[in-house]
């Protein structure tokens, strides 16, 4: 939620006997972080550790295969999106620890908090691309045999990244640092000031393009894929269903609180009690969305273990099996194991 969403304690209890010293907190509670902020910090720490290590490993595994394996291209791009977002976490973590004080300057304020939105759009667009690929493999195998290649996959990824950057621009442009007079604090957020309509438009576009439309299209897409898969009695269809549900669900589950509070805040009066309550929950909603940045490697590993019984292989080789297996298109009606399995992997980044 891009609004200035940081709440500080009220200072209504002074009398003339109090001493107002900038070097010591005047409010008794001002050194204590709120529970939502503490939870956000815990989530950020876990996401950073798992996200950086896990996605770095995924990048390392897929980078070597990306020249020849289309699935590796998809997973490489998703991992890069996640990895980039995770790099902002130490700064966001530091800011929350300092009660949302932002000592990092205007440029960092514009760029770093926007990374999670870039991740959201890049991931959902890449996911849409991957889903289209899965769909074509099932329903247009001949076309895939003729045209499905690494070059086209890279072009599709480039288009996804370009669109993601475009969609992130509004939030990026409206991000500003504001120095509050008392308590002395620099805050980083977006300020639409006179333009409440534009704020609402940005929130609606984000909800529709980053959540509702993908939810609808991906649900339809995977419904068709799974129906076809079942009708052909493809192997591992039950396992596939479970993983695909996990895959699609995770993106929407982890973005849901952010999207709901974001749209609500854009329609509420900024001084209303509900708005102020939602502001207090903002860091938690952002951190919850950030879970998407570390969930991919976890699902890859879980899926890899599931498909191979027990974890006998090393982590890189297990990931290599899951992420770089190429879908072989056959003219026969049978649906290949790799098509089912790779579809089953977590293909969402955010």
């Amino acid at each position: 939620m891009d609004s200035f969403n940081y709440t500080t304690p009220d200072y209504g209890h002074y009398d003339d006997k109090d001493t107002l010293d900038l070097n010591t907190p005047v409010d008794k509670t001002s050194n204590t972080l709120r529970v939502p902020d503490i939870l956000a910090l815990v989530i950020f720490a876990v996401v950073f550790l798992v996200g950086v290590l896990g996605n770095a490993l995924v990048v390392w595994v897929t980078a070597f295969e990306a020249k020849r394996t289309i699935n590796a291209i998809w997973f490489l791009n998703l991992a890069v999106a996640d990895f980039l977002s995770c790099l902002a976490l130490p700064i966001l973590f530091t800011s929350i620890v300092q009660h949302h004080h932002w000592p990092f300057g205007g440029a960092a304020c514009s760029i770093l908090p926007s990374l999670i939105l870039l991740n959201m759009y890049a991931s959902i667009l890449l996911l849409a691309t991957i889903s289209a690929d899965r769909f074509l493999l099932v329903f247009k195998p001949i076309w895939c045999q003729n045209f499905r290649g690494a070059g086209l996959a890279w072009i599709a990824c480039a288009v996804a990244w370009g669109l993601a950057l475009l969609l992130t621009i509004p939030s990026f442009l409206y991000r500003v640092v504001r120095e509050e007079y008392f308590p002395p604090k620099v805050l980083c957020g977006v300020d639409y000031s006179h333009d409440k309509r534009r704020e609402r438009a940005v929130a609606i576009v984000r909800l529709v393009l980053g959540f509702l439309w993908p939810l609808l299209t991906l649900t339809i897409c995977y419904t068709f894929i799974l129906l076809r898969t079942w009708s052909r009695r493809a192997t591992r269809s039950t396992k596939t269903l479970k993983v695909v549900v996990a895959v699609v669900a995770s993106f929407f589950i982890f973005w849901l609180p952010y999207q709901v509070t974001g749209i609500m805040m854009s329609f509420l009066e900024p001084s209303s009690p509900t708005f102020l309550l939602l502001k207090k929950l903002d860091s938690l909603c952002v951190s919850f969305a950030y879970i998407n940045c570390c969930i991919n490697p976890i699902i890859y590993v879980v899926a890899g273990q599931g498909f191979q019984g027990r974890l006998r292989k090393s982590l890189p080789s297990l990931l290599r099996n899951v992420l770089t297996e190429e879908s072989v298109v056959r003219e026969s009606k049978s649906f290949t194991r790799s098509t089912v399995d790779t579809m089953a992997q977590k293909t969402q980044a955010v």
């Epitope: 002074y14 107002l20 308590p183």
Partner: antibody, heavy 125, light 112 residues
């Protein structure tokens, strides 16, 4: 009662420096921040900065940062503003103003409840 | 910096009339604690400014109830229900949400 006593007038040459004073009485001097505000003839008000008398912490408007220095002397309950490199643009009335710690349910030192009567600074060669 | 724009610059009134002064800020004045730190001062000729209204709508001690303030975010209004002779002077709005603190250019309330 609370009073902020300022010298009536000051005269200085362009390029010179001047130190204006503001003597507080009627309250505990170290308990309230003191702000300085500039008003050019027939113009609006411009905030210069504030000082916290208990620890000498001061915050400035960037427009004045290099030319204004705020200090206090707790023993005499007096605040000072030192203006250097004076130009004709500095010809103005300078007010000191106090912020409350609390007033009727407000939150912190946000508004000026008492003002000095102002010092007219004339810059002339 | 937050620019405070007051309208009108001059407001001719008859005594007993209702008066309204508008103040618009270039940025939202909503503090992170939810308050709008927008205040109103009156300056009479040859005097220092005096506080009338603080934090949008709170009357300072001794200020008559004919003065009222309202607004939020970027748009604020000071209303005087029945103008009296002692109300004449220049009215300034001021914000203390953000650094630097800034003032409006002033509205001169004068007799028609």
């Amino acid at each position: 009662q609370v009073q902020l006593q300022q010298s009536r007038a000051a005269l200085a040459k362009p390029g010179a420096s001047v130190k204006l004073s503001c003597k507080a009485s009627g309250y505990t001097f170290t308990n309230h921040w003191l702000h300085w505000v500039k008003q050019r003839p027939g113009q609006g008000l411009e905030w210069i900065g504030y000082i916290n008398p208990i620890n000498g912490f001061s915050k400035y408007n960037q427009n004045f940062k290099n030319r204004a220095t705020l200090t206090t002397d707790s023993s005499s309950s007096t605040a000072f503003i030192h203006l250097s490199g004076l130009t004709y643009e500095d010809f103005a009335v300078y007010y000191c103003a106090r912020v409350p710690l609390s007033y009727g349910g407000s939150y912190g030192p946000y508004f000026f409840d008492f003002w000095g009567q102002g010092t007219i600074l004339t810059v002339s060669s | 910096d937050v620019v405070m724009t007051q309208t009108p610059l001059s407001l001719p009134v008859s005594l007993g009339d209702h008066a309204s002064i508008s103040c618009r800020s270039s940025q939202s004045l909503i503090h992170s604690n939810g308050n709008n730190y927008l205040h109103w001062y009156l300056q009479k000729p040859g005097q220092s400014p005096k506080l009338l209204i603080y934090t949008v709508s709170n009357r300072f001690s001794g200020v008559p109830d004919r003065f009222s303030g309202s607004g939020s975010g970027t748009d604020f209004t000071l209303k005087i229900s029945r103008v009296e002779a002692e109300d004449l002077g220049v009215y300034f709005c001021s914000q203390s949400t953000l650094v630097p603190l800034t003032f409006g250019s002033g509205t001169k309330l004068e007799v028609k």
